[in-house]
Interface confidence: medium
């Protein structure tokens, strides 16, 4: 399932709430085709969360996932 702020493969706005770090399974960058640069976090429930890559909380969550999953961003 997609979060309400995720439209297909792109983000039109950023999630403004707290990022549930402990419930994140992976993250990826949206493509250059998208209106906004964004990092999308995917939760254990399969929900997608659009996030601002410049936000300190987002960077912290990415670092957490990088430590947890050594593969880093799951992009081809």
């Amino acid at each position: 399932a997609r979060g309400t702020n995720v439209g297909r493969e792109c983000c039109l706005e950023y999630f403004k709430g707290a990022i549930p770090i402990s419930r994140l399974t992976r993250w990826y960058k949206t493509s250059g085709e998208c209106p906004k640069d964004a990092i999308v976090f995917v939760t254990v429930q399969g929900k997608s969360i659009c996030s601002d890559p410049k936000d300190k909380r987002v960077k912290k969550a990415v670092r957490y996932l990088q430590r947890t999953w050594k593969g880093g961003p799951q992009e081809s």
Epitope: E9, L12, G32, E33, P35, K36, Q74, S76
Partner: antibody
Framework: QVTLKESGPGILQPSQTLSLTCSFS??????????VGWIRQPSGKGLEWLAH???????RYNPALKSRLTISKDTFNNQVFLNIASVDTADTATYYC??????????????WGQGTLVTVSA | DIVMTQATSSVFVTPGDSVSISCRSS???????????LYWFLQRPGQSPQLLIY???NLASGVPDRFSGSGSGTAFTLRISRVEAEDVGVYYC????????FGAGTKLELK
């Protein structure tokens, strides 16, 4: 019916600022997911993306030209503007504007203007 | 920047025949979401470019199904079956995984 039309000075001298206008109809930059981009093409050569602007005023620039480019919009009058500072003869080209839409059919540059030829000459 | 290479500058085709035009990228255009961010445009003589294919294999609105796109992450092909006179022009590939960059173009001419 979506249409775009570019206008510019035609000829200008080196070191001047090039001001381009894209006037469009058939869509609105008030619409979420809508954008307009600029692409140029020197005579007999290939295409180069310059910049684009989104409905929410988010702007993107070609990194190689970023310091010289300024893109802006007038949503009410359905116009997008591009300024290129300190032009040189290498900026001689046909300049196109094109529509971008993130929506039911996400496709970049699906609609183009006819282009406007700009010559930089001393 | 991702570099797009169209190694063949021109191709000559007999009307009614098929032709393939190739393009390569310096980096894989396959995203983790499954999309491949490769576009094809046709610029007919004296005209503006026209979108043919987006995301490697999707036909743009109003484009005849004689055109088709395929490829892998870095190697792409535009195929035109039953070439017609109106297909003459320059074909450009464009990547959009990152900021858009175009190939140098391949000119299609009739024999």
């Amino acid at each position: 019916q979506v249409t775009l039309k570019e206008s510019g000075p035609g000829i200008l001298q080196p070191s001047q600022t090039l001001s381009l206008t894209c006037s469009f109809s058939g869509f609105s930059l008030n619409t979420s997911g809508m954008g307009v981009g600029w692409i140029r093409q020197p005579s007999g050569k290939g295409l180069e993306w310059l910049a684009h602007i989104w409905w929410d005023d988010d702007k993107r620039y070609n990194p190689a030209l970023k310091s010289r480019l300024t893109i802006s919009k007038d949503t009410f009058n359905n116009q997008v503007f591009l300024n290129i500072a300190s032009v040189d003869t290498a900026d001689t080209a046909t300049y196109y504007c094109a529509r971008i839409y993130f929506g039911s059919s996400l496709a970049w540059f699906a609609y183009w203007g006819q282009g406007t030829l700009v010559t930089v000459s001393a | 920047d991702i570099v797009m290479t169209q190694a063949t500058s021109s191709v000559f085709v007999t009307p009614g025949d098929s032709v393939s035009i190739s393009c390569r990228s310096s980096k894989s255009l396959l995203h983790s979401n499954g999309n491949t961010y490769l576009y094809w445009f046709l610029q007919r003589p004296g005209q503006s470019p026209q979108l043919l294919i987006y995301r490697m294999s999707n036909l743009a609105s109003g484009v005849p199904d004689r055109f088709s796109g395929s490829g892998s992450g870095t190697a792409f092909t535009l195929r035109i079956s039953r070439v017609e006179a109106e297909d003459v022009g320059v074909y450009y590939c464009m990547q959009h995984l990152e900021n858009p960059t175009f190939g140098a173009g391949t000119k299609l001419e009739l024999k």
